[in-house]
Amino acid sequence: MKVLQEPTCVSDYISLSTCEWKMGGPTNCSAELRLVYQLVFLISETNMCVPENNGAAGCVCHLFMEDMVGADNYTLDLWAGQQLLWKGSFKPSEHVKPKAPENLTVYTNVSETLLLTWSNPYPPDNYLYEKLTYAVNIWNENDPTDSRIYDVTYQEPTLRIAASTLKSGVSYRARVRAWAQSYNSTWSEWSPSTKWYNAYKEPFEKHHHHHHHHHHH
């Protein structure tokens, strides 16, 4: 039994790290392998993760970690029974993939503005709580080319956009993801999307003006 692609791990920097690797051939990951991990510190428990299959030869393990600090370093040992297949280490703060934002809501009743809000997925005592910035993806359900991304580079989990920037009488969807620049993280997964109908109508004067203008041509 041989490891083809060594484990690579990412951490949500709160409680979960996910490691993936590939074996040399078809493997029943949960029956044949164990990933043992331990925080390098005075008082720390040895933990064991039972991997799941990710394809015929791929394995994935969810490592539970608690109370992370920036300097944390974990030893990782991949075992097949009594045989040590691979030995490595993992520093969560250097491989951060934030949790996805939650509770995305779209408010359409704020005059001619769409207000999108979501919640920060971290509690206030977590380092990432004040470090996340966001990207919001809005797209037309019926036209995949009508899609845009708004960068939310401030920390408040809200976005305001003019309803007039979207097509009227069309159903739109939005989703949001997060990243932490200070930890050079990757982007989180997208949040679940939320749907709304853009009922915005152009003001009559503007509509009339456009119509008149068209008539003269």
């Epitope: 709160i14 409680s15 979960l16 390098v40 510190f41 005075l42 008082i43 539970f64 608690e66 109370d67 600090v69 920036g70 300097a71 944390d72 703060s93 509690p123 206030p124 005592d125 380092y127």
Partner: antibody, heavy 116, light 112 residues
Framework: EVQLVQSGAEVKKPGATVKISCKVS????????MHWVKQAPGKGLEWMGR????????IYASKFQGKATITADTSSNTAYMELSSLRSEDTAVYHC?????????WGQGTLVTVSS | DIVMTQTPLSLSVTPGQPASISCRSS???????????LEWYLQKPGQSPQLLIY???NRFSGVPDRFSGSGSGTDFTLKISRVEAEDVGVYYC?????????FGQGTKLEIK
Amino acid sequence: EVQLVQSGAEVKKPGATVKISCKVSGFNIKDTYMHWVKQAPGKGLEWMGRIDPTNGYTIYASKFQGKATITADTSSNTAYMELSSLRSEDTAVYHCVSRRPWFAYWGQGTLVTVSS
Amino acid sequence: DIVMTQTPLSLSVTPGQPASISCRSSQSIVHSNGNTYLEWYLQKPGQSPQLLIYKVTNRFSGVPDRFSGSGSGTDFTLKISRVEAEDVGVYYCFQGSHVPYTFGQGTKLEIK
């Protein structure tokens, strides 16, 4: 052997500032959160706040926001807490504690007396 | 803030007899990572507090097995199966799940 050695007792006048140190040996403070706990005379324990020495990230109980400032110097393996605008009710023993992820190691405490 | 309420506030026990201290939190102290960071500390006279129990039921290294922790949700208990003279002091429960972290008001144990 793990030791958290705090600076000595202080007597300060109202309105003054005091800075207490907590020198750690036996482990690297970057590997833990460093917390501070207040104990007024004859009273119970009160959590004040904490720091992650690696990135300097601090969080405080609202009661101590603006009163306490927690810092850490990883090169000397020392945590600090400064108390400002001292009043008589700040008279207490202050403990530094490392948490990973429970309070396993405590300093001996520093008595700060505020008296005119 | 989560309020931790201990009962009784004082306890007088004959050596060799059991003792029990209750701690109730004003709301759930399950952390977002699924753990319950409920701990028990003993502060002996003239000393700094020392850890007895972490994560509700786990005895810290070197703590005698006469100490045990139990509970879930918002109700937790520390039991001493047979009290010894060296157990005197003030016992505190503590929640480290939600900021601001909070201690109970303490229970003073004396020997009869």
